[in-house]
């Protein structure tokens, strides 16, 4: 996930936000799956 060649603060911010959103989605799916399996 290189997300381009720009290293300015805005590009870094957008990349960080994307990672947070992605992890939140993944963890949310895992949590829902655990609840569903109980």
């Amino acid at each position: 996930h290189s997300d381009g060649i720009f290293t300015d603060s805005y590009s870094r911010y957008r990349k960080q936000m994307a990672v947070k959103k992605y992890l939140a989605a993944v963890l949310g799916k895992r949590y829902k799956q655990r609840v569903k399996n109980k």
Epitope: H1, D3, G4, Y10, S11, R14, M17, A18, V19, K21
Partner: antibody, heavy 109, light 111 residues
Framework: VEESGGRLVTPGTPLTLTCTAS????????MGWVRQAPGKGLEWIGD?????TTDYASWVYGRFTISRTSTTVTLKMTSLTTEDTATYFC????????WGQGTLVTVSS | AAVLTQTPSPVSAAVGGTVTIKCQSS????????LAWYQQKPGQPPKLLIY???TLASGVPSRFSGSGSGTEFTLTISGVQCDDAATYYC???????????FGGGTEVVVK
Amino acid sequence: VEESGGRLVTPGTPLTLTCTASGFSLSSYAMGWVRQAPGKGLEWIGDISTYGTTDYASWVYGRFTISRTSTTVTLKMTSLTTEDTATYFCARDYWLSLWGQGTLVTVSS
Amino acid sequence: AAVLTQTPSPVSAAVGGTVTIKCQSSQSVYDNNALAWYQQKPGQPPKLLIYAASTLASGVPSRFSGSGSGTEFTLTISGVQCDDAATYYCLGGYYDPADNAFGGGTEVVVK
């Protein structure tokens, strides 16, 4: 960068536009969509990260959806009105550093 | 959503002269410098000139420069050439990307 899928549609018809790339790996870049109505200015629609997470302009109101595979980025549009008539551009990076020629979407009854 | 207001069109310039285009945002851009400038000629897609308020994009001539911070930004073209006749747009990036927006554009006419 190349966009495709633009055509004449009637109001309310859904339409999907596709963006492909040559000379670089699309999967390594965030990609954005921008539109331009005939004779008007540029309008930012939204973008998609390499992780597949998306952000949209506040005016989109869930009518448009951006998604991606390893080789394409798509813009799915629903509830189209005549106001959505425009050339739709796909561009690379959050800073929109490389643009395609655009694909024309005409919404008319 | 943010509103970006640009210098009204058209702006006239003589070859060899200097052109200044202003872009004012209704709210501060991210980190006070998340602003880009684009050049668009008729029938062509836009081209990135400046990003992060003042950083020149790859391959862009040094006669283009950007400045400003927060809500007020400027694109300057020094030593204007005929090839610079185009419409110029600013794009603001914000803490909430839902606010991202372009300015209305400024047409530059070269005499």
